[in-house]
Every structure is written in structure tokens, then in C-alpha cells.
């Protein structure tokens, strides 16, 4: 209360307004002027936040009223001013003054979880005691008032498995909890103020509580026995089945490893991190024959057990798997990977060569039957028995490497093949020969024991030791005693003057027969042409000038065939002009008797067998118009380059270095003329022949020199080479 | 314009409590003081009492201790409650309305009801 | 509280005559807050002057109020037939309200 000290002024309350009233009005408390006597004089004004709207005064009375419901959750207090007034003067009778209205609390609010939802995770198993959560509620109402925010918690659902404290809100486990029958509970909790006593407000709020997995089980096969099948024809690696465990963990505490126990040399079991399942691994391929059923016995382990779990781990689950091998009709199997047979060269047609045996490793064995591929040298019976059809040429061929194929008489589709190599053993049925083309140059003046050429010769036997040849004079040139030969024992020789003096113009030419004997049995001996010339040298004794003069007459000799070829050339142009002048007027056919197109048929002989099959025809009109002929060599040259292709023929074929020289000219020939052929194919012909017993068919291999040649019965062919005897005819004039 | 209508019985017996009720309409029962005057039969006017649309009442001290005036502006009306009535309180009641807006004194009564015979009677 | 006589309690007069009705307080009335009521025989008491002198709205100007302290005076100029009727005084300057008790205004 309050009361000015000269005992006039304001008198009232401290004012107290409960909150949430219900009614129209609340009458808060008066204003009151001692200076009021009552004379209804005063009038009485409330001022300030809430005057006249929360807040109403009596003007008369000077009784405040509260017409609006106050909520102290909202504002608990109102600081207003008052004022008195004597309504006969309009002034105020005292200063005016300010007080309060405080709002008293009333329990008008539930406690509330403000930070729901509540959601907790606790391992499974955990002991009683393990602290799950804390839930707080918060309760509006003024804590400094009574109960009213005194919170109090209970359970209203969870019991048994968990308990609260009942002014903490701390949730703890109450009794054990395995996961694997139940992952989650709900737990409905309620707060209560006024410590729980009659009137107390109560709020609730729910806690899902889920259970965490630890590694509490162990993973078990759900069959005693898995059934399995896999084909013997699968390859390793194969994924064959699959067996499955279960373990009703989760996640990381589910993942699990298999392995068997026992056969790991056959099968394996890998984990599929996505499925678990085992997944059964062939890891060496079955055989049906062999063995058609296995009985492995395969265990499961969870990867990763904490050392306090394993109790829960002690005994590993097993199972059997039955893999059961499914028979495939099998191809039939050699009983050697390879075979290496050996035969003499020249053996006689159906001369033994060897044996292979393959058989049918299915249960049926079926009969087999063998054939060779592409051969016609060897064939095969229905015992694996291996003859040849064709004598055999060490020199032309020193090994053949054969495929043999076996097939299934009742299934032809089972097919397999095994490499045959045969090597041909040397006999010895070559004589030595000059290893090159000797020409040699003795002095007029030459003295007696002057060696004039120092030879060397081959053997195209294959010899076990090294060759050994002997060189010797034919007996009539031993007789005519104007050259000796000494042996050096080194397969060589020289040939030496027997005498004093020569005559170029008696005898300007020496033919001397050299026999050359090797060691060989039996041993083969062959003649052998040296040619001496004899030389006007100079003073010096030297026969390089010789030797010079013979070079330049057969540059000059080769310049007159040059120009002779290019004058054959021009008549080709001239008459194949003619003949186009002709066509232009009359269209003639090319050949009269027969108007259809002419292609012959170019037969290469070289490959064994197949002969028949290298048949591609090239049409000679087109052959005819090529404008740049490749330069003509002489028959030495030309014999010597086939020799040393025909050598390397022997080893591995024809060198690429000589068919780049001669594509790279035909390019030339392309370029230079337009009107040359389609360089469509290569077909090689300087081995042409070289593999048939009849030897060669081209005329480079002719004994008769080029300047011999004649080509006159080229005419006697008929219309058909017609154009080729005119061709041939007309080059061998102009060279003439 | 604002008219006021008196309801309640018209016949009380005694030591029971008069309840009448007047309504106000045309007009806001707010902002005014509201006052039940009485009148016995053949004889003057007596004021009952006042209430104030927040709740505020002023009672004529010879009837204060049985008189309550209450007001429910929800419905545009105030009550009369006059408790232990003998035959002293049988009368013509009327309901008045003070004639100033918010006055902060006391004023005539410019607006009446047509009045309510309550008659006190065994 | 104040007590309010008022004089004479009857007075018989022709229309067109001139009244006046006395109305005395037992003490001074302050702010001259005192009023003057017309009552019909079955009507509610209507209002005619407040504050002692000031008309009522819709009162003809032949009513007039006068007095301070504790005499006043209502005045009919020239009376109407419909003018007769009982005349009270009322007094609200200090609680409790109160009212004389009438004049009864008759024709002669």
C-alpha cells in the first residue's frame, strides 16, 4: 500500500490479475484518492500499454477492470500510470503515478517435449542399466510459482525392457533385448507438473528406440546337403552353384566366408559380397570318365567376430555339397600332344611314315577315323597309319608339318587335330657342284705353276659331318697336261698353268672338266665346265686389261639389245595402233574362230599339292599392251639369280627384298603408263617348276643360250598365238 | 435509436431472490453506465443500483447487501439479482441508462425501460 | 445521503398557466447535479432538464430549470393539457442517487 506522507494522496494495491479468467471482466483491484470524498468529482484515468483495451477503469469508482483473458505465458506483467481528476476545475488532483499489475500464474500449461521426435539407437544385448536417452519437457508455467512446472516423468509404455527416471527423464534398458526378434520398440513417456498431484497437467511424447546388431549369431546353412551339377567341358573359373547360409545379423555382423574343408584342388567357394551366398568355383577342370561325382564338405564363418562375441562363434556351420559331372561328348584325344616321325628322302610311294593314335575318351568309345589336311604327299588309314603317295625330296623339302584330325565315327562334329612333323632324311643323291660361275684369264706369257683360279663347290646334301669334296681333273684334261689341279683339302682348289706359254690365236679358249667327288656313300661325283680365255696382257703379266675389254664388249653387246628392244617395242606400238585403226572401221573379233574372250590359265607348280587349286586366269590382251619391258639379262645371269632364289627357297621362301624390287618396278611400269594392267596379284614364277619331278617349264631354265632362242614354233600353234609368235618373233630380229 | 426491455417474473415470493434481466438493443451495451431504479406502487422513484459494462458496480447502500448487478456484454444485457425479498420489494423496475458517454461523474438518466411490475407474494 | 423535498406535492392549474415546482436538497447538490423527470400514469419517468438547467434533447423550450446549492426550480411557461402529469427531482452528485418524492401537476 501506499500512502503520501502528508497523508493525501494516492492509495492502492500492488494489483494481481490471474491469468486465463474466464469471465467478461476481472476486477483487478481501485485506484483510490484519499483526497475523494465521495462527492462524484474525481474522475479517475488509467494510461499506458493495455489502458483501455486489456485494461478498463470506473472513472466514477476508480475501479480497474481486466476485460480481456490475460495469459502470463504471454506477458506477466503490465506497468501502467493513473491519474485523478476533479471534473469541476478539468485538474488533475494529484501528479500522476505509476503501478503495477502483475499476472499471476495459474497451471494453464501441459508440459511439452519441444524436441520430439525422440529417436534412440542402443546395441542389442545391452545390460540393464544402459543409458538409452534423455527426454526433457519444458512446461510454460512460472517455475517460481507453486507446482505448476514441477515436472515429474513416467512410463507409459516400454515396460519391461526399459524404465525412467522420474525427475530426469533418463530412459535406461531394464532387461535385455535381443534384436533379432524385435529391432525396434516404442516408448511412450508422460511428464506430469504439479509433481503429479491431483489437477497435475500432463504432456506425452513417444521414443522409437531401435536396436543396433552386434554379431550375436553365428551363419548356419539352411540344407544339410547341396546338389550341384557341372559339365565336364567346363573351363576353369565356371561359377557352378551356389549355396547359401543364413545369419540373422545384419550388415557387417552378416558378412560371411566360405571354404571347403576338404578337395580345395577341384572346387572353391567365393563370397558374393552382395547376395552372401557362396558361390561354388571349378577350379581344375573334371573329366566324366575320371570321376563323375564329388562329395566336398564346405563350412561358413561370419568375417568379422569382436573378440567379446566369440562365445556366440565357437562351432562353424558345415554342409555337403554333391557336385554331380554331367558327361560331354568329348572330342577324341591324341595320346601325343605332337608327333615327330623321320623318313628317308626318296622312300618309295606308300612307304611307311608313322602312327598316331587318338581315342575316345567318353564311355561309348566311339571308333575314330583320320584324315590329313591338304596333302598330297601322305595319307592316313583308319589305324592312324601314315605312308607317302609321292616320293620325297630332302632338297626341295626337309621337313613337312602335317595336321591330322581325328573324328568321331558316330559324331563327325567331335573333331580333333594334332601337329605332325616329318623330317626328311638326307641320302646322299646330289654330286658337289661349282659353288659359282667360274670365268677364267691366263697370260700368253704365262709360266708354268702359275695359278690361274682358286674354286670351291657345293653339295646340296645335307651332311651329317662337314662335306668333304675332291677336286680332280677329267681324264682327258689330264691328258692334254696344259692345267693341273691341286686339291687343298679344304673344299677347294687351283688351277694351276701345267706349261709355259699359251696362243690366243690357236687356242683362245680352255674348256677344262673338273670332277668333284664327295664323301657321301655312296659318293657322287659331277663335271664341272671351267673356262679359261687367253690374254694379250701387258707387260706386268696382269690380266685386268683383259678382263676390262671383255667388260666393255658386253656393255656394248647390251646396249645393242637395249636398243633393239626398244625398237620391238615401237613396232608392238605401231601394230597395236594399226589394229585399233582397224577396229575403229570393222569391229573385228580378235580371234575369228572364236569371238569369246581368251584367258589362259597360269599353273604354278612350286607348292606341294594344291596345284589344282592355284588356277587364276589373267587375260592376255591386257598382259600385251605393257609398254616397258624389264631389262632381258643374259643366260648366265638369269641362271645364276634363279639358283640363288632356288637356295633360298630351301629355307625359308622366297626373300621379301626380290618381290619389294619387283612390285616397286611394276609400280613404275603403272605410273609411267596408263595403259598397263591391274596390278591386281602377284604370281611368282622364279621358282616356277622347281618342286615337280618334270624340273622347270620356263625357258630361263633352258641349257640354250638367249642369242639360240627361237620362237618360230610359236607360229605353229594356231590363231591363238598368233600375236605371241609376232611378239617374240619381231624381239628376236631386233636383238638379231 | 437504443431501446431497453425489462424481462423476469412478475411474481416472487418472498425470502427468494428477484432476478430480472434487461436488454439492451439498437445500441452497444458498452461505454455506459447501466442503472435498475424501483418504484412501489403509488410512491417515488428509488435507485438500485449501477453497473458499468466492464463490470464496475455501484450500489445504493440501503440495498447493497442483497443486490448484485451483473452484465453479459455478449448478449447486450445486465441483470438485477435482489436476494431475501419481502412484500417491501414489490415495485415497478426499471432499467436506465446514464445519458454521458464515459462521463467520469454521475448523470441523469435519458433512456428507460418501460419497467417490470415484480410483486412480492406468498 | 442527500434527501430531495419537493414543493407543494400538489398543484392544480389550467393549461396555459404558468407552474413552477420546487425541489430542495439536504445539502448543497455539488456540480449542480440534479435533474428534473416527467412520469405519466403507465410510462417510465422521462427525462426533461439535467444538470439543473440544461434540456433534454427533444424538450420543448416552455421547460426551463434553474437553483444551485440546495434550492432548485423546474418552470412550465404556459401548460399543455398533455403537460400534466407527476414531476420528479433527482439528485447525482453524490452517491447515493436519489429522487423527491414528486409533484403531482393537475388541471383545475
Known amino acids: 500500500d501506499y500512502k503520501d506522507d502528508d497523508d493525501k494522496g494516492w492509495v492502492w494495491n500492488q494489483f494481481f490479475v490471474p491469468e486465463e479468467m474466464n469471465t467478461t471482466s476481472h476486477h483487478v483491484g481501485r485506484l483510490r484518492s484519499d483526497l475523494d470524498n465521495g462527492n462524484n468529482s474525481f474522475q479517475y484515468k488509467l494510461l499506458g500499454a493495455g489502458a483501455g483495451s486489456t485494461f478498463i477503469i470506473d472513472e466514477r469508482t476508480g475501479d480497474i477492470y481486466a476485460i480481456e483473458k490475460l495469459d502470463r505465458e504471454e506477458r506477466s506483467l503490465y506497468i501502467l500510470r493513473a491519474q485523478v481528476i476533479d471534473i469541476t476545475t478539468g485538474r488533475a488532483v494529484e501528479p500522476e503515478s505509476e503501478f503495477v499489475i502483475k499476472v499471476s500464474d495459474i497451471n494453464d500449461n501441459e508440459p511439452k517435449f519441444l524436441d520430439e521426435p525422440y529417436e534412440a539407437i542402443v546395441p542389442e544385448m545391452s545390460p540393464e542399466g544402459t543409458l538409452v536417452i534423455q527426454v526433457t519437457a519444458t512446461d510454460a508455467d512460472d517455475p517460481a510459482s507453486g507446482n505448476n512446472a514441477r515436472l515429474l516423468y513416467s512410463l507409459l509404455q516400454g515396460q519391461p525392457y526399459f524404465s525412467i527416471e522420474p525427475t530426469t527423464g533418463v530412459i535406461r534398458i531394464s532387461s535385455k533385448m535381443d534384436r533379432e526378434l524385435q529391432d525396434e520398440y516404442w516408448v511412450i513417456i508422460q511428464a506430469k507438473d504439479m509433481i503429479g498431484l491431483p489437477g497435475a497437467l500432463s504432456g506425452t511424447t513417444s521414443v522409437l528406440i531401435k536396436l543396433s546388431d552386434v554379431n550375436d549369431n553365428k551363419p548356419i546353412f539352411k540344407e544339410r546337403l547341396y546338389r550341384l551339377t557341372v559339365s565336364e567341358s567346363a573351363p576353369t573359373g565356371t561359377s557352378i552353384g551356389r549355396i547359401m547360409a543364413y545369419d540373422n545379423d545384419i550388415g557387417e555382423n552378416a558378412e560371411m566366408d566360405y571354404s571347403i574343408e576338404d578337395d580345395s584342388q577341384t572346387f572353391d567357394i567365393i563370397t558374393n559380397n552382395e547376395t552372401q551366398e557362396g558361390i561354388v568355383i571349378l577350379k581344375k577342370k573334371v573329366d566324366f570318365e575320371h570321376q563323375n561325382h564329388y562329395l566336398i564338405r564346405a563350412n561358413v564363418k561370419n568375417r568379422h567376430v569382436a573378440e567379446h562375441l566369440m562365445e556366440y562363434h565357437v562351432e562353424a556351420s558345415t554342409t555337403f555339397v554333391r557336385v554331380q559331372v554331367e558327361d560331354e561328348d568329348e572330342p577324341p584325344v591324341f595320346l601325343l600332344p605332337y608327333y615327330l616321325f623321320e623318313i628317308l628322302e626318296e622312300s618309295p610311294h606308300g612307304s611307311f611314315v608313322g602312327m598316331v593314335s587318338a581315342t575316345d575318351p567318353d564311355q561309348r568309345k566311339s571308333p575314330i577315323r583320320y584324315s590329313i589336311t591338304r596333302s598330297k604327299v601322305f595319307s592316313i588309314d583308319d589305324n592312324g597309319t601314315i605312308i607317302t603317295t609321292n616320293p620325297l625330296d630332302r632338297e626341295i623339302s626337309a621337313w613337312y608339318n602335317l595336321s591330322i584330325t581325328a573324328t568321331e565315327k558316330y559324331n563327325v562334329q567331335q573333331i580333333s587335330a594334332v601337329p605332325v612333323y616329318v623330317q626328311v632324311l638326307n641320302i646322299n643323291d646330289h654330286a658337289p657342284e661349282f659353288s659359282e660361275y667360274y670365268d677364267s684369264y691366263v697370260c700368253e706369257n704365262a709360266g708354268s705353276g702359275q695359278v690361274i683360279q682358286t674354286i670351291s663347290a657345293v653339295d646340296r646334301d645335307e651332311s651329317v659331318e662337314d662335306h668333304h669334296f675332291y677336286f680332280n681333273l677329267s681324264v682327258e684334261d689330264t691328258k692334254n697336261s696344259s692345267f693341273i689341279i691341286i686339291d687343298n683339302e679344304d673344299n677347294t682348289a687351283v688351277i694351276l698353268t701345267n706349261r709355259t706359254g699359251f696362243s690366243l690365236q690357236e687356242e683362245p679358249v680352255f674348256y677344262i672338266s673338273v670332277l668333284i667327288a664327295d664323301n657321301g656313300i655312296p659318293s657322287l661325283t659331277s663335271t664341272n665346265t671351267l673356262t679359261i680365255h687367253i690374254c694379250d696382257c701387258d707387260d706386268y703379266g696382269s690380266t685386268q686389261t683383259c678382263r676390262d675389254k671383255d667388260l666393255l664388249l658386253s656393255m656394248g653387246f647390251r646396249t645393242e639389245v637395249i636398243l633393239a628392244i626398244l625398237i620391238s617395242i615401237m613396232i608392238i606400238f605401231g601394230f597395236i595402233f594399226l589394229i585399233l585403226g582397224l577396229k575403229q572401221r570393222r569391229k573385228p573379233t580378235l580371234f575369228p574362230e572364236k569371238g569369246e574372250d581368251f584367258r589362259e590359265n597360269i599353273f604354278r607348280y612350286d607348292d606341294e599339292g594344291g596345284g589344282e587349286e592355284d588356277t587364276e586366269a589373267f587375260d592376255i590382251v591386257q598382259l600385251r599392251s605393257s609398254t616397258i619391258m624389264r631389262e632381258r639379262k643374259t643366260r648366265k645371269t638369269a641362271a645364276a639369280e634363279i639358283r640363288s632364289l632356288y637356295r633360298q627357297s630351301l629355307q625359308v621362301g622366297p626373300d621379301s627384298a626380290i618381290f619389294r624390287k619387283f612390285i616397286l618396278e611394276k609400280l613404275e611400269e603403272a605410273n609411267t603408263d596408263p595403259c598397263a594392267p591391274p596390278f591386281d596379284s602377284l604370281q611368282t614364277y622364279a621358282f616356277e617348276g622347281t618342286g615337280s619331278l618334270a624340273g622347270s617349264l620356263s625357258s630361263l631354265g633352258s641349257a640354250v643360250s638367249d642369242q639360240d632362242e627361237n620362237y618360230d614354233y610359236l607360229n605353229e600353234l594356231g590363231p591363238r598365238f598368233k600375236r605371241l609368235a609376232c611378239m617374240f618373233g619381231s624381239a628376236m630380229q631386233s636383238n638379231n | 435509436q437504443v431501446q431497453l426491455q425489462e424481462s423476469g417474473p412478475g411474481l416472487v415470493k418472498p425470502s427468494e431472490t428477484l432476478s430480472l434481466t434487461c436488454t439492451v438493443s439498437g445500441g452497444s451495451i458498452n461505454s455506459y453506465y447501466w442503472s435498475w431504479i424501483r418504484q412501489p406502487p403509488g410512491k417515488g422513484l428509488e435507485w438500485i443500483g449501477y453497473i458499468y459494462y466492464i463490470g464496475s458496480t455501484n450500489y445504493n447502500p440501503s440495498l447493497k447487501s442483497r443486490v448484485t448487478i451483473s452484465v453479459d456484454t455478449s448478449k447486450n444485457q445486465f441483470s438485477l439479482k435482489l436476494s431475501s425479498v419481502t412484500a417491501a420489494d414489490t415495485a415497478l423496475y426499471y432499467c436506465a441508462r446514464d445519458s454521458r458517454y464515459r462521463s467520469g461523474w454521475y448523470d441523469a438518466f435519458d433512456i428507460w425501460g418501460q419497467g417490470t411490475m415484480v410483486t412480492v407474494s406468498s | 445521503d442527500i434527501v430531495l423535498t419537493q414543493s407543494p406535492g400538489t398543484l392544480s392549474l389550467s393549461p396555459g398557466e404558468r407552474a413552477t415546482l420546487s425541489c430542495r436538497a439536504s445539502q448543497s447538490v455539488a456540480g449542480s447535479y440534479l435533474a428534473w423527470y416527467q412520469q405519466k400514469p403507465g410510462q417510465a419517468p422521462r427525462l426533461l432538464i439535467s444538470g439543473a438547467s440544461s434540456r433534454a434533447t427533444g424538450i420543448p423550450d416552455r421547460f426551463s430549470g434553474s437553483g444551485s446549492g440546495t434550492d432548485f426550480t423546474l418552470t412550465i411557461s404556459r401548460l399543455e393539457p398533455e403537460d400534466f402529469a407527476v414531476y420528479y427531482c433527482?439528485?447525482?452528485?453524490?452517491?447515493?442517487?436519489?429522487f423527491g418524492q414528486g409533484t403531482r401537476l393537475e388541471m383545475k
Open positions: 433527482q439528485q447525482y452528485g453524490k452517491s447515493p442517487i436519489t
